[in-house]
C-alpha cells in the first residue's frame, strides 16, 4: 500500500491522543534505554510503511502484536485516514485470523514495540517531509 495520500495530521492526532499512550502502557516497567533503535524512517509515507509492517508482520520471537490495543488503534487510524487502505488489508486480516495465537509479552515483543515508538516519534517530528 502507498501511504502517500494519507491525512498525516489526522493520523498524528490519533497517535498523540491514544496510540502513544497505549505504547507506553505496553512498555510499562521497561527502561527507555533498554533497547537500541535499529530502524528509522525518512518521511511520513516511509514511517507509516514501516509502522504498518512492524506492527502487523510476525517476527522471530514475537509472533503477533496485532491484537494489542495500540495495533488495533493503528489499524483503525490507517483505515480511516488512508484512502483505500482497508481494501488492501482484507486478505491480510483473514490470514491473520487463521494464525491467531495466545497473547504473550516476550522480551522480543518489548524490543519490537520500542522500535515502533521510535518510528512513531520520527513520524511525529514537525520538520519531517510529507513525501
Amino acid at each position: 500500500y502507498d501511504f502517500t495520500n494519507c491525512d498525516f495530521e489526522k493520523i498524528k492526532a490519533a497517535y498523540l491522543s491514544t496510540i502513544s499512550k497505549d505504547l507506553i502502557t505496553y512498555m510499562s516497567g521497561t527502561k527507555s534505554t533498554e533497547f537500541n533503535n535499529t530502524v528509522s524512517c525518512s518521511n511520513r509515507p516511509h514511517c507509516l510503511t514501516e509502522i504498518q509492517s512492524l506492527t502487523f508482520n510476525p517476527t522471530a520471537g514475537c509472533a503477533s502484536l496485532a491484537k494489542e490495543m495500540f495495533a488495533m488503534k493503528t489499524k483503525a487510524a490507517l483505515a480511516i485516514w488512508c484512502p483505500g487502505y482497508s481494501e488492501t488489508q482484507i486478505n491480510a486480516t483473514q490470514a491473520m485470523k487463521k494464525r491467531r495465537k495466545r497473547k504473550v509479552t516476550t522480551n522480543k515483543c518489548l524490543e519490537q514495540v520500542s522500535q515502533l515508538q521510535g518510528l512513531w516519534r520520527r513520524f511525529n517530528r514537525p520538520l519531517l517531509k510529507q513525501q
Epitope: T38, V39, S40, E50, S53
Partner: antibody
C-alpha cells in the same frame, strides 16, 4: 562486530539475471536493522538498490524496482539480490550493507560484476 | 528526485592542512544527510550522519555542518590516511535515496 561478505558470479550475460548473496556474521539479520544492496559502476558514484528490514518490509530504488528482488535466508543468516534483464549499464561493484533504513553503517568489501557476452 | 552536487571534484592539500568539502542538495533535505569515506579498493565507511553526528569510532578531526540544502564536511588537520574520496548521501526522500558524485582529496 558485524561483518558482511558478498559472493556470486563475476560475469553475467546481457538479458540474464544477476544473483548475489551476502553472508552476515556477528549479528542476526532477524534481530534488527535493515539489510541493503548498493552498487558502484567503475569510476562512478554510489547508487542505492534497495533493502529489507529485519521484520520483512522491503523497499527498492524506483529506477530499478521492476527488475530487483531482495530476499533473505534467516537459517543461513544471509540475504540475496536478484537483478533481472541486465545490460552493460549494470556492470558495477555491488556492496551489501547494514542500514537503519536511512544510512549505511557497515559494508561488505564489494564484488565486481561484469555484464558482457 | 533530489540531486546531490559535491564540490570541488578534487581537492589537493598537504598533510596537516584543513579540508573543506561541500555538498549541495537540489531541494531541502533538512538534516537528513550522511558523509562517507572511500579509499581505493575498499568499501565506503560512514563518517557522519544527521548532518553533524560522528559515527562510532570516527576521529574528532572530522566534523559535519549544515542543514536544508548546503552541507560541509571539514577535516580539521589532514592525516595521511585521510586522502580518499568522500561522498554525501541524502535520506530525506525515501524511496529515492541519492549520493553525490564524490570529492577526491589528494596529496598536493
Amino acid at each position: 562486530q558485524v561483518q558482511l561478505q558478498e559472493s556470486g558470479p563475476g560475469l553475467v550475460k546481457p538479458s540474464e539475471t544477476l544473483s548475489l548473496t551476502c553472508a552476515v556474521s556477528g549479528y542476526s539479520i532477524s534481530s534488527g536493522y535493515g539489510w541493503s544492496w548498493i552498487r558502484q559502476p567503475p569510476g562512478k558514484g554510489l547508487e542505492w538498490i534497495g533493502y529489507f528490514s529485519y521484520y520483512g518490509s522491503t523497499s527498492y530504488n524506483p529506477s530499478l524496482k521492476s527488475r530487483v528482488t531482495i530476499s533473505r535466508d534467516t537459517s543461513k543468516n544471509q540475504f540475496s539480490l536478484k537483478l533481472s534483464s541486465v545490460t552493460a549499464a549494470d556492470t558495477a561493484v555491488y556492496y551489501c550493507a547494514r542500514t537503519n533504513l536511512l544510512y549505511f553503517d557497515s559494508w561488505g568489501q564489494g564484488t565486481l560484476v561484469t555484464v558482457s557476452s | 528526485e533530489i540531486v546531490m552536487t559535491q564540490s570541488p571534484a578534487t581537492l589537493s592539500l598537504s598533510p596537516g592542512e584543513r579540508a573543506t568539502l561541500s555538498c549541495r542538495a537540489s531541494q531541502s533535505v533538512s538534516s537528513n544527510l550522511a558523509w562517507y569515506q572511500q579509499k581505493p579498493g575498499q568499501a565506503p565507511r560512514l563518517l557522519i550522519y544527521d548532518a553533524s553526528s560522528r559515527a562510532t569510532g570516527i576521529p574528532a578531526r572530522f566534523s559535519g555542518s549544515g542543514s536544508g540544502t548546503d552541507f560541509t564536511l571539514t577535516i580539521s588537520s589532514l592525516e595521511p590516511e585521510d586522502f580518499a574520496v568522500y561522498y554525501c548521501q541524502q535520506y530525506s526522500n525515501w524511496p529515492q535515496y541519492s549520493f553525490g558524485q564524490g570529492t577526491k582529496v589528494e596529496i598536493k
